[in-house]
Amino acid sequence: MRTEAQVPALQPPEPGLEGAMGHRTLVLPWVLLTLCVTAGTPEVWVQVRMEATELSSFTIRCGFLGSGSISLVTVSWGGPNGAGGTTLAVLHPERGIRQWAPARQARWETQSSISLILEGSGASSPCANTTFCCKFASFPEGSWEACGSLPPSSDPGLSAPPTPAPILRADLAGILGVSGVLLFGCVYLLHLLRRHKHRPAPRLQPSRTSPQAPRARAWAPSQASQAALHVPYATINTSCRPATLDTAHPHGGPSWWASLPTHAAHRPQGPAAWASTPIPARGSFVSVENGLYAQAGERPPHTGPGLTLFPDPRGPRAMEGPLGVR
């Protein structure tokens, strides 16, 4: 048995007392806009599990959904930039793996996902409200980071089954199909916008969806961008943050789950052939960063509408290196 926590995928606000036509007018352009805005955006997902057998033992799994080659993965805890994160492991696809206590075993699961097991005892062991972050430096896309943590109410004896999501096939047909849908969607969105530009916009009502009951969606192409469009950034106090380790500076990011076939070529640890990738779930916080790996510290001012960025205040790789004072 284990407790799982994933970052929420959020839904667009539900309309209030609108007619059926109003509902369609509001939701369809919103969905299409999201598809257009987020198409092609790399994503990072994070899963944090607490093992029921060892209550202070954690497994962190992270993955990258993007077309570039992963050049480095950094796993840390303690929160995003400014919160003084601590590096737990660094995985390099060619040069190997480095890990620091309480990390017990870091490994590549697939070409684009990693897992890290943390020791369950000692002064530096994590606890349930610890925030874990995974940063993927991808070439040429840049650096993308996501954070996740177990919600405070997690019961290690219970394991809520993750909400299922459709399997995304990463083959040529799938890519062409998705591209076609996106292209059609964007064109249709423009058509709708032109058709309705003179109509008064309906007032949006706040969503009445229960935070404990995530709704399933047919397809959500970009967790990172969608979640960041809606979720306010929140810092989770990590009372268990170790004093024994030195600080780095991880940033925040998105996560949720699906299944994605991945070809596990040329990874040193001989990863499995399947990657677990995110599906919608509630709890934790989300943020996203896209800082070019080749221009660390020089963050773009915007990465799409409403995205929360955490630029490196120290500038490009200050004397203590790209992860800050370590």
């Epitope: 050049s71 620091w100 040429p140 790996y293 004072v325 370590r326």
Partner: antibody
């Protein structure tokens, strides 16, 4: 201030041994990969060896089996044990820091090793 | 092993000149490349990391570009203190390898 200070260089006969040391200060030593890089007189730079934070080691082919890199995190110290030395090993040896995966950023001033009969 | 071929091996230039040094990798190294400056009797000093990012404290007249197999170090306006030898280093894979060096001399 981040500093790396090498010592232990000197004149040694072919086939002899020498142990180089590097004292690190001003940063958290255990969080970094540490390298030895050498430069023969009038020549370019040549990477020799790397050791990860937990003791993972990597060597240049020509020194493998003869050189041993090691570290003592508690003492902020890096070492290079050089055995079966050859004339071709004559060089200035630099101790270098790397934040793993991001390249070498801080270099020591170097220590000179001369292998000659 | 990844070979790094640096050119030219030496060049003569005057103060104020624009200087370009190139480094070619025998296989793709993404942007896992740094540029270093070395003066006689001194240790190397890093100028550029990740192919194009300027190391903290290094003057902005130095810039790096390129990715994959072709990389360039440019000094926009050569200063008297820039006369030195420059090396590129790939840190994608073991063994880490340096370019042969480019000596920039006063014309």
């Amino acid at each position: 201030e981040v500093q790396l200070v090498e010592s232990g260089g000197g004149l040694v006969q072919p086939g002899g041994s020498l142990r180089l040391s590097c004292a690190a200060s001003g940063f958290t030593f255990r969080n970094y990969d540490m390298h030895w890089v050498r430069q023969a007189p009038g020549k370019g730079l040549e990477w020799v060896s790397d050791i990860g934070n937990s003791g993972e080691t990597y060597y240049l082919g020509s020194v493998k089996g003869r050189f041993t890199i090691s570290r003592e995190n508690a003492k902020n110290s890096l070492y290079l044990q050089m055995n079966s030395l050859r004339a071709g090993d004559t060089a200035v040896y630099y101790c270098v820091r790397e934040e793993f995966g991001y390249g070498m950023d801080v270099w020591g001033q170097g220590t000179t090793v001369t292998v000659s009969s | 092993d990844i070979q790094m071929t640096q050119s030219p091996s030496s060049l003569s230039a005057s103060v104020g000149d624009r200087v370009t040094i190139t480094c070619r990798a025998s296989q793709g190294i993404r942007n896992d490349l740094g540029w270093y400056q070395q003066k006689p009797g001194k240790a190397p000093k890093r100028l550029i990391y990740a192919a194009s990012s300027l190391q903290s404290g290094v003057p902005s007249r130095f810039s790096g570009s390129g990715s994959g197999t072709e990389f360039t170090l440019t000094i926009s306006s050569l200063q008297p203190e820039d006369f030195a030898t420059y090396y590129c280093l790939q840190h994608l894979d073991y063994p880490l390898t340096f370019g042969g060096g480019t000596k920039v001399e006063i014309k």
